[in-house]
């Protein structure tokens, strides 16, 4: 959480960004909010990024100016029209790019004053991991599976029996490159399994982690994903 | 409401240049949220994007067409203009313009289109 | 660039009847989609965008969903004048695409 103020004393005013993560080729939001006028017509909103000569995007007088727009932001960018009265100066990003990742300045100026704040912004690839019995392997087996990370993640498996147990010397994981050359789907095969407990698949890298759980009992199957975002934690 | 209006020639020689332009009426080209685009279908087949531009007179264009293809706008008469240069029977088609989402990037509204035909 | 892929090529309903239609993308295209209808002799008009949202005017028993790179356009029920030919259209990347398009007949 990052907040920002105006330089020149009483006509300053609060702007509040929020680091967040682009997953590369989703469309991401990078998070901006102000101190709302009453006016539409007096509110600018200023994007703009480290290192890029034009603007990630502008908006004023009630509606976008994209002439001083960079190129490589052409076509992928909104505010949200309707929300910019109440304070949300947030931008949607299209189709996110590794390119994309760097520092971002969400700039305001309204009829109260002037303010800025930073954002960070990382882009890589996350994604859901699935847990299956793996019925190809000769023994017991679990395939945890994500088809999407970037960078290169860590895969370590764990069980609710067996807590603290190290399973890198019976698992296997391997990295097949997505056919867009930069993601990789995550394969990682945890050999003799055993009946009636938990097993977790932890997938992580320096933007997010996500765990796959499979409960095998004798009578059925769970199963449970979830992912979080390790760089939004203000 | 907002509408649009293709005009030019309906036939063109091989070789030369195809010109048309899309006038605008019902609303400005100097909106900020949207871009001005160019659409072609040739008889019988699909669609296909051939490029836009924004009032500031920015563009981008399809690299199938890049070479060829010049968009430009005149805010004063409210029009925007298409050049498809060195043109073949390939480039017969029904050429449309359209308002052109900033994003998101739907083309809505069409104007009516009209057909160019590429003949000696 | 993105190769747009709808299936079936024609479509023969029954006024009356629910048209489903398919769009693939060659790879993921998040939401950012469109789908459009053209009748012989008129330019094409936009039904859906953002996969899922309805134009303004359009009739309700159009309904869009998908996401990523299968997308599907339904007519819950046909009326006379939706008999037409159907296109989807990602934005997601430059240069932007269109599907082939499908032909929705009178059975």
């Known amino acids: 959480l990052i907040i920002g103020f105006g330089i020149s004393g009483r006509h300053s005013i609060t702007v509040t960004t929020l680091t967040s993560a682009g997953n590369i080729g989703e469309d991401g939001i990078l998070s901006c909010t102000f101190e709302p006028d009453i006016r539409l017509s007096d509110i600018v909103i200023q994007w703009l990024k480290e290192g890029v000569v034009g603007l990630v995007h502008e908006f004023k007088e009630g509606k976008d100016d994209l002439s001083d727009q960079d190129e490589m932001f052409r076509g992928r960018t909104a505010v949200f029209t309707d929300q910019v009265i109440v304070g949300n100066a947030s931008l949607r990003l299209k189709n996110v790019q590794l390119t994309d990742a760097g520092t971002y300045k969400c700039y305001i100026i309204t009829s109260k004053g002037k303010g800025n704040a930073n954002l960070e912004y990382k882009t890589g690839a996350f994604s859901m991991p699935e847990v299956n019995l793996d019925y190809n392997a000769s023994s017991e087996s679990l395939r945890c599976e994500a088809p999407r990370w970037f960078p290169q993640p860590t895969v370590v498996w764990a069980s609710q029996v067996d807590q603290g147990a190290n399973f890198s010397e019976v698992s296997n994981t391997s990295f097949e490159l997505n056919s867009e050359n930069v993601t990789m789907k995550v394969v990682s095969v945890l050999y003799n399994v055993t009946v009636n407990n938990t097993y977790s698949c932890m997938i992580e890298n320096d933007i997010a982690k996500a765990t796959g759980d499979i409960k095998v009992t004798d009578s059925e199957i769970k199963r449970r994903s979830s992912l979080q975002l390790l760089n939004s934690r203000a | 409401q907002l509408q649009l209006q293709e005009s030019g020639p309906g036939l063109v020689k091989p070789s030369e240049t195809l010109s048309l332009t899309c006038t605008v009426s019902?609303?400005?080209?100097?909106?900020?949220?949207?871009?001005w685009g160019w659409i072609r279908q040739p008889p019988g087949k699909g669609l296909e994007w051939i490029g836009n531009?924004?009032?500031?007179?920015?563009?981008y264009y399809n690299p199938s067409l890049r070479s060829r293809v010049t968009i430009s706008v005149d805010t004063s008469k409210n029009q925007f203009s298409l050049k498809l240069s060195s043109v073949t029977a390939a480039d017969t088609a029904v050429y449309y313009c359209?308002?052109?989402?900033?994003?998101?990037?739907?083309?809505?509204?069409w104007g009516q289109g009209t057909l160019v035909t590429v003949s000696s | 660039e993105i190769v747009m892929t709808q299936s079936p090529a024609t479509l023969s309903v029954s006024p009356g009847e629910r048209a489903t239609l398919s769009c693939r993308a060659s790879?993921?295209?998040?939401?950012?989609l469109a789908w459009y209808q053209q009748k012989p002799g008129q330019a094409p008009r936009l039904l859906i965008y953002?996969?899922?949202t309805r134009a303004t005017g359009i009739p309700a028993r159009f309904s869009g969903s998908g996401s990523g790179t299968e997308f599907t356009l339904t007519i819950s029920s046909l009326q006379s004048e939706d008999f037409a030919v159907y296109y989807c259209?990602?934005?997601?990347?430059?240069?932007?695409?269109f599907g082939g398009g499908t032909k929705v007949e009178i059975k």
């Open positions: 259209q990602q934005y997601h990347s430059f240069p932007f695409t």
């Open positions: 790879q993921s295209v998040s939401s950012n």
């Open positions: 359209a308002r052109e989402g900033s994003y998101p990037n739907q083309f809505d509204p």
């Open positions: 531009i924004y009032y500031s007179g920015s563009t």
């Open positions: 019902g609303g400005s080209i100097k909106s900020g949220s949207y871009y």
């Open positions: 953002g996969a899922s």
